[in-house]
Structures are given as structure tokens and as C-alpha cells.
């Protein structure tokens, strides 16, 4: 029963290597390195920001989703696989979509940074489906989601006349709703006898906490690298840091408060400590003073604890989505909180500066957000339907959250 399904044994290597060969050919014909003279010190500074994002994606999001008792290997490794594939496709796609007519794609540290952020959205979405899909299905999900996010950004750029690179600010919301929709499309019920696969064990929860710590340390780097203005970059970093600090305090105390015996839940904590970072993500450069970021961190922490308690039940009963990562369900709420905060701050900013375009700016922002959600839902639905095709030989529901389906173990230890 723990043997590889035929799809994974036969289709995956061929499918993945063919795709990789296609990417190599695309890189050969359509890309070249940036020939402009970048100061060496500038290069190092830019690389460090890119490095931070990679640490967040590979270690942070990789370990964050490893909190399933029998699915920790797959969570970490599949995340890395998706990141590696996603970055390659995102670089090409961003290059093709941001220049019209398409010429050669110039690869710079900035384009790698953008691509990493695009790939990170896939990792966030994957939190809703990891354990229920095989690697071949995840490859499809990477390709579709990166393409959908790129398309969203291009559409927003053309309709709302904003810079193509700036539109990544919607990626929290996009990723969350894309993932939820894909999860909704997947086979629902878990037969009796597989519930133990879904149980969170102490060690995986500790590794998930490690992932949360990596994300916590580097989160200011994800909220600031696309900002041009040094002042705005500083604001973004400081505001993110304060919001994260407050959400940690809120997470630990709120988790204890939510428990009848006042005990702290590791699952709640590793989700809620990051709440502040998500909540200020969209508006961190507009927040004028630390106290406001701290209030947002507090609100976000409380929403996270409440969400961690209620959302899984709500998703299960109302939407029929089972066993999505708590962090993922929280992204969907906090992403919206962040977008609403952005709109409020936009109004305040235009009022303070005596700009008469308030209504127009707000309409634009609501329009962008609505479009992001619509494209996330439709592309998520398309992906979900694609993943349900029989050709992928998806894991049987009895084999959900089971590393043994995918991995060669040196020995099958009892109680694994």
C-alpha cells in the first residue's frame, strides 16, 4: 500500500524533465544577462534582499507547512521543487509580459526578486492542497498560478495604468483565494482510518515553528524590496517589524486566552506570529507612525487566533474544504485586512495632501482588489478542474498526508 502510484513513478520524471528542457530552451533563445554597469556594492545589497526572499520561501514557507505528522518530508521538498520551477517560469513570464512587443528578457537581480515573490504566491496557495496532490499536479499548479498572477498584473497595469512591477502588492490575497478555490475542487471526504495522518505531532509542529521563525525574521524583506524610495523602504521595514513584534505578543497571549485551560497552542502561535506582516504588507510604506503599525499587528494577531479557531471548521462545514493549513486560511482574512487598510490610508493621505482625487483613487484600489480576487477564483477553479483529471493519477483520499506514497524510506519505522 505504500508503493509509489504509477503516475509518480513514470509520468513525473518525464513530465518534469521535459518541462525543464523546454525552460532551458526558452532561456537560451529569449534571455540574456543585464549588461549595465552595476556598482559592486549595489550588487551585493541587491543580492542580500533577494537572498532574504529565498530564505523565506525555501526555509520559511517550506517548514511552515510541515506540521502534518506523516507529511513533513513532502511539505519541505515539494515546496522547494515548486519554488525552483516557479522562479524559472516567473522570470520568463515577467519578461514577456512587462515589455510589449516582447524582445529579449533581460535578467537582473530585480527580475529574480520579482520572480521569487511570484513563486512565493504559489507556496502560499499550496498550503491549502499539500498532502492531497502529487508532484505532477503541483507542477501544473505552479505553471497556472504564476501565469495567472502575471496576467493579473498585466491586466491591472493596462486597465488601471499602474506600473507592472507594483501590482505584486495583491499577491497575498491572490495566493490565498487561488489556493482555497483549488482546495475546494479537490476530492472532499477523508475516509475513516486516515485521520491520524492529519494529526499534528510535536516534532513537525516544532519544525513548523522553525519555519514561522524564519518568516518572522525576514518578513520585512518581503514588504520592502519593490519600493523605490529609500524613505518608503525604511517605513516599510520598520512598520513591518513593529507589526510583527506586536502580533507575537498577541499570538501567545491570545492563544492562551482562547483555550479553556489557558494553555498555548503551537498551531495557533506559528500562524499568528506572522499576522502583522501580512496585515501591513500592502500599506506598510503609507503608515506614518509606528503606533498605527502596532495597532494593525494587534488586530491581525487577534483575527489570527479567532481565525485559527473558527476558520478550519467554517471551511470544512460551509465550503467543504478539509484540512487546509491554518496559516493559509488566515492569509485570506489578513490579506483583505491589509487591502482595506491600504484603501483607508490612501483616503487619509489624499485628504492630508488636499488632493481632490480621493473617490477616484479609492475606486481604482477597490477595482484592483476585486480583479485580483476574481482572477484568483477563476484561475483557481480552472486549476482545480485540471488537477481533477484522471491523467494525473492523484493520490487516493486514503493516502492523503502520507509521505510513504512519495518517498523511499531506509526503513519503515513502526509508528512513523
Amino acid at each position: 500500500s505504500s508503493k509509489y502510484p504509477r503516475s509518480v513513478r513514470r509520468c513525473l520524471p518525464l513530465w518534469a524533465l521535459t518541462l525543464e528542457a523546454a525552460l532551458i530552451l526558452l532561456f537560451y533563445f529569449f534571455t540574456h544577462y543585464d549588461a549595465s554597469l552595476e556598482d559592486q556594492k549595489g550588487l551585493v545589497a541587491s543580492y542580500q534582499v533577494g537572498q532574504d526572499l529565498t530564505v523565506m520561501a525555501a526555509l520559511g514557507l517550506g517548514f511552515l507547512t510541515s506540521n502534518f505528522r506523516r507529511h513533513s518530508w513532502s511539505s519541505v521538498a515539494f515546496n522547494l521543487f515548486m519554488l525552483a520551477l516557479g522562479v524559472q517560469w516567473a522570470i520568463l513570464l515577467d519578461g514577456f509580459l512587462s515589455q510589449f512587443p516582447p524582445g529579449k528578457v533581460v535578467i537582473t537581480l530585480f527580475s529574480i526578486r520579482l520572480a521569487t515573490m511570484s513563486a512565493m504566491s504559489v507556496l502560499i496557495s499550496a498550503g491549502a492542497v499539500l498532502g492531497k496532490v502529487n508532484l505532477a499536479q503541483l507542477v501544473v499548479m505552479v505553471l497556472v498560478e504564476v501565469t495567472a498572477l502575471g496576467t493579473l498584473r498585466m491586466v491591472i497595469s493596462n486597465i488601471f495604468n499602474t506600473d507592472y512591477h507594483m501590482n505584486l502588492r495583491h499577491f497575498y490575497v491572490f495566493a490565498a483565494y487561488f489556493g482555497l478555490t483549488v482546495a475546494w475542487c479537490l476530492p472532499k471526504p477523508l475516509p475513516k482510518g486516515t485521520e491520524d495522518n492529519d494529526q499534528r505531532a510535536t516534532i513537525p509542529s516544532l519544525s513548523a515553528m522553525l519555519g514561522a521563525l524564519f518568516l518572522w525574521m525576514f518578513w520585512p524583506s518581503v514588504n520592502s524590496p519593490l519600493l523605490r524610495s529609500p524613505i518608503q523602504r525604511k517605513n516599510a521595514m520598520f512598520n513591518t517589524y513593529y507589526a510583527l513584534a506586536v502580533s507575537v505578543v498577541t499570538a501567545i497571549s491570545g492563544s492562551s486566552l482562547a483555550h479553556p485551560q489557558r494553555k498555548i497552542s503551537m498551531t495557533y502561535v506559528h500562524s499568528a506570529v506572522l499576522a502583522g506582516g501580512v496585515a501591513v504588507g500592502t500599506s506598510c510604506h503609507l503608515i506614518p507612525s509606528p503606533w498605527l503599525a502596532m495597532v494593525l499587528g494587534l488586530v491581525a494577531g487577534l483575527i489570527s487566533i479567532g481565525g485559527a479557531k473558527c476558520l478550519p471548521v467554517c471551511c470544512n462545514r460551509v465550503l467543504g474544504i478539509h484540512h487546509i493549513s491554518v496559516m493559509h486560511s488566515i492569509f485570506s482574512l489578513l490579506g483583505l485586512l491589509g487591502e482595506i487598510t491600504y484603501i483607508v490610508l490612501l483616503v487619509l493621505h489624499t485628504v492630508w495632501n488636499g488632493n481632490g482625487m480621493i473617490g477616484f483613487q479609492v475606486l481604482l484600489s477597490i477595482g484592483e482588489l476585486s480583479l485580483a480576487i476574481v482572477i484568483a477564483l477563476t484561475s483557481g477553479l480552472l486549476t482545480g478542474l485540471l488537477l481533477n483529471l484522471k491523467i494525473w493519477k492523484a493520490p487516493h483520499v486514503a493516502k492523503y498526508f502520507d509521505d510513504q506514497v512519495f518517498w523511499k524510506f531506509p526503513h519503515l519505522a513502526v509508528g512513523f
Epitope: 556594492k41 549595489g42 499602474t162 506600473d163 523605490r228 529609500p230 510604506h285 490612501l346 483613487q361
Partner: antibody, heavy 128, light 107 residues
Framework: EVQLLESGPGLVKPSETLSLTCGVS????????WSWIRQSPGKGLEWIGE????????HYNPSLKGRVTISKDASKNQLSLRLTSVTAADTAVYYC?????????????????????WGRGLVVSVSS | ELQMTQSPSSLSASLGDRVTITCRAS??????LHWYQQKPGKAPKLLIY???TLQSGVPSRFSGSGSGTDFTLTISSLQPEDVATYYC?????????FGGGTKVEIK
């Protein structure tokens, strides 16, 4: 109010290196992007390059074929421009300028703000 | 490299006239276009940024419009102090490029 003042030699020999500095007062250089622009006699404006005051990130005009280096000294709150192998075509008025800030246009690839503060300019002649 | 083409290269108008200067980009620059005024012997001065936003301290008779590739600077009522050369400039990536300039004189 921010003030920018360009300084350096007014006369440079061909094939030598032109070195200019731009002193900034009334603003910290680490909070803005800074550009160098030049204007040849009777001609339009030509952008030379820019530097991010908070990092060492720079972008240069490809037309200057790698002859240009822009740097900063945060402790002195000043910027520098080096242009090597100068010719008579490099004779111009050299300006340093600060990029403004528009909180509603935050993006690394593009600036929504324009160059809101300029120095008075320094006339540089290249002649033997 | 993005080219900025300004027209006309020079114009002469009477005091109080409405003056319009156009600027065309060779590619889409969204609204990342700015207008400058340069008086003889002086440094350029920013008038309008992001295509239509008036820089603080600039008289309201100056206005900007346009998006994508076609932009316009309008002086609603020409004043003696508006005699200058006007430049457009894009900031949609590097290198930044300026238009050739439009010299405005009074009849």
C-alpha cells in the same frame, strides 16, 4: 529647504578624468535617489546616471559606455561623479538633482515623482 | 532606449493665450512623465510630475494630461515669467530621457 551645490574643476584636458562632487544640505542623502544630468551648450538635457542614497545601487546611461561612476559619502552628505577618458563632447553644464517622493507611486523599477530639486549647475569645459 | 519627441520645438504666443506643448514617447510609459521649465542660465525646475500632478509652489495655470505615449502640458494663460524652454522627461525605467525641449516666447 534642500540645497545642492556642484563643485569641481571647470577645465579638464582631453583623455583625463572629470571628477565632480555635489554637496547636499537640508536633506539626508540616504533618504532619496540622486541623479546627475548634463546639458551641452545650446543642447537639451542628458541623464548621466543615478544612485540610491540608502544602498549603493546605481544605474547609468548606456551611451556613456562604462566611463561613468557615481558614488556617495553619507558621512559628508555628498555625491560624486567620475567620468573617464573625456573628450570635447563632454563639455557641458553638469547638474546634480534629487528625485522627489510620491507615496502613491511606490515602485523600484520606475519613479513617479520627477527630479524636484536641482543644483545651480557647474560649467565644465574639455580642452587642451 | 525610449525616445521622447516634443512638439513644437519653439512657439510664440501673446500674453494671456492658452499654450499647449505635446510630448510623445516611443513606447508606453504609463503616467511616468514629468515636465520641467528652464529659464536661460538657470537649472530646470519641476512643474508637473506623474503626468498630471502639480508640483507644490507651481502656479495653477500649468496643467498636464495624458497617459501611455501621448502627453500634453498646458499653460492656460501665458504670463511674461513663463518665457522659458520646457522639457518633458520619462522615468519608466532607465535610462531616463528628456524631450528635445520647446522654447516659449512672447509675441
Amino acid at each position: 529647504e534642500v540645497q545642492l551645490l556642484e563643485s569641481g574643476p571647470g577645465l579638464v584636458k582631453p583623455s583625463e578624468t572629470l571628477s565632480l562632487t555635489c554637496g547636499v544640505s537640508g536633506a539626508s542623502i540616504s533618504n532619496y535617489w540622486w541623479s546627475w544630468i548634463r546639458q551641452s551648450p545650446g543642447k537639451g538635457l542628458e541623464w548621466i546616471g543615478e544612485i540610491d542614497g540608502s544602498t549603493y545601487s546605481t544605474h547609468y546611461n548606456p551611451s556613456l559606455k562604462g566611463r561613468v561612476t557615481i558614488s556617495k559619502d553619507a558621512s559628508k552628505n555628498q555625491l560624486s561623479l567620475r567620468l573617464t577618458s573625456v573628450t570635447a563632447a563632454d563639455t557641458a553644464v553638469y547638474y546634480c538633482a534629487r528625485e522627489g517622493q510620491d507615496p502613491l507611486a511606490p515602485t523600484l523599477a520606475t519613479s513617479g515623482s520627477g527630479l524636484d530639486s536641482w543644483g545651480r549647475g557647474l560649467v565644465v569645459s574639455v580642452s587642451s | 532606449e525610449l525616445q521622447m519627441t516634443q512638439s513644437p520645438s519653439s512657439l510664440s504666443a501673446s500674453l494671456g493665450d492658452r499654450v499647449t506643448i505635446t510630448c510623445r514617447a516611443s513606447e508606453n510609459v504609463n503616467n511616468y512623465l514629468h515636465w520641467y521649465q528652464q529659464k536661460p542660465g538657470k537649472a530646470p525646475k519641476l512643474l508637473i510630475y506623474a503626468a498630471s500632478t502639480l508640483q507644490s509652489g507651481v502656479p495653477s495655470r500649468f496643467s498636464g494630461s495624458g497617459s501611455g505615449t501621448d502627453f500634453t502640458l498646458t499653460i492656460s494663460s501665458l504670463q511674461p515669467e513663463d518665457v522659458a524652454t520646457y522639457y518633458c522627461q520619462h522615468s519608466y525605467g532607465t535610462p531616463l530621457t528628456f524631450g528635445g525641449g520647446t522654447k516659449v516666447e512672447i509675441k
